[in-house]
């Protein structure tokens, strides 16, 4: 399986909400011995590998933001901790999973990573991640709403089909 990032760059005005999205692609084993753990964290563009470093999002760790279920099942963060920080992660039946950040500030600018861990019980774990940049702007040059820029590897039909997921 792979993780696709429909948008590689989100440019948003301060105070706006944004939903960053990743999509699970490829064959997904739906057997009882496989589950998927999905989460989000901030990182930096490392020289060797992007997303290798895990930093908190608004003081919440990837452990606090995770989703855990089998295959293409819907889920969302169940506790109030994330929502108190203006965050919510969610997943749908189509392999899309997202994190919504409310009331953006300049401090939210940076690199965000989604992580999927495929857990094959009693055997192994396989990790895949996706990366996207969030730029929060203020002043006269800031857009009035979030502007999203497609990833070069993403097909245009997917961008159009899922456009509504990313304008908030």
């Amino acid at each position: 399986f792979k993780v696709a990032t429909p948008y590689s760059l989100y440019v948003c005005p301060e105070g706006q909400n944004v939903t960053l999205t990743c999509r699970l692609l490829g064959p997904v084993d739906k057997g009882h011995d496989v589950t998927f753990y999905k989460t989000w964290y901030r990182s930096s563009r490392g020289e060797v590998q992007t997303c290798s470093e895990r930093r908190p999002i608004r003081n919440l760790t990837f452990q606090d933001l995770h989703l855990h279920h089998g295959g293409h099942q819907a889920a969302n963060t169940s506790h109030d901790l994330a929502q108190r920080h203006g965050l919510e992660s969610a997943s749908d039946h189509h392999g899309n999973f997202s994190i919504t950040m409310r009331n953006l500030t300049l401090l939210d600018s940076g690199l965000y990573c989604c992580l999927v861990v495929e857990i094959r019980h009693h055997h192994s774990e396989h990790r895949v991640h996706g990366a996207m940049e969030l730029q929060v702007q203020t002043g006269k040059d800031a857009p009035s709403n979030c502007v999203v820029y497609p990833s070069s590897s993403q097909e245009s039909e997917n961008i159009t089909a899922h456009h509504h997921h990313h304008h908030h």
Epitope: T35, Y37, V48, S52, F62, Q63, D64, H66, H68, H79, D80, L81, L115, V117, I119, H121, H122, H123, S124, E125, R127
Partner: antibody, heavy 118, light 107 residues
């Protein structure tokens, strides 16, 4: 910040039983995978068992399979290890630790000592 | 089961010296390897994750590298508080396994 505190250790005879507990502070315990790890006196670390946030799946080291049972009560923010048919080689400090998929043991309790001796 | 072999078993050094610890896996663990520090009477502490990333709050004098089967932890200049036992651990497969440890002692 979550803190972990183990209890329930003590002296037990070979063949006996003991139940260890790990109490977690913090509201997000139910989100975490948890493990038990032990360390025999003067020896290295040995992973014993792991339980997912929901209570299933569960994993055991071969050395304890069939004798130890891991469980959790998310409503009580507690992790347990039921140890039966104890042997001298089970003597160790037992630690509970947070253990997320694709991650490592980043949060540990201070441990509780289990001594199996006649 | 993946066996992790650490060397040397003991490293005798003076404060300010450089320490180089090795961990070798019996089969590839990709970059899914961590290093821990343990002081007497204390629980282990995560130092390094995914072979080369420092955990939160770990000083820059700790660095690590490697992938596959060969991994190295380096302490560039030993501080008095660095004298401890260091363990590597893999999570590429079940069961989770640790190396037997390297003790860094004061010379």
């Amino acid at each position: 910040q979550v803190q972990l505190v183990e209890s329930g250790g003590g002296l037990v005879k070979p063949g006996g039983s003991l139940r260890l507990s790990c109490a977690a502070s913090g509201e997000t315990f139910s989100d975490y995978y948890m493990s038990w790890i032990r360390q025999a006196p003067g020896k290295g670390l040995e992973w014993v068992s792991e339980i997912s946030n929901s209570g299933s799946p569960i994993y055991y080291a071969d050395s304890v399979k069939g004798r130890f049972t891991i469980s959790r009560d998310n409503a009580k923010n507690s992790l347990y290890l039921q140890m039966n048919s104890l042997r001298a080689e089970d003597t160790a400090v037992y630690y509970c630790a947070r253990d997320e998929p694709g991650w490592y043991f980043d949060l540990w309790g201070r441990g509780t000592l289990v001594t199996v001796s006649s | 089961e993946i066996v992790l072999t650490q060397s040397p078993a003991t490293l005798s050094l003076s404060p300010g010296e450089r320490a180089t610890l090795s961990c070798r896996a019996s089969q590839s663990v990709s970059s899914y390897l961590a290093w821990y520090q343990q002081k007497p009477g204390q629980a282990p502490r995560l130092l390094i994750y995914d072979a080369s990333n420092r955990a939160t709050g770990i000083p820059a004098r700790f660095s690590a590298s490697g992938s596959g089967t060969d991994f190295t932890l380096t302490i560039s200049s030993l501080e008095p508080e660095d004298f401890a036992v260091y363990y590597c651990q893999q999570r590429n497969n079940w069961p989770r396994t640790f190396g037997q440890g390297t003790k860094v002692e004061i010379k």
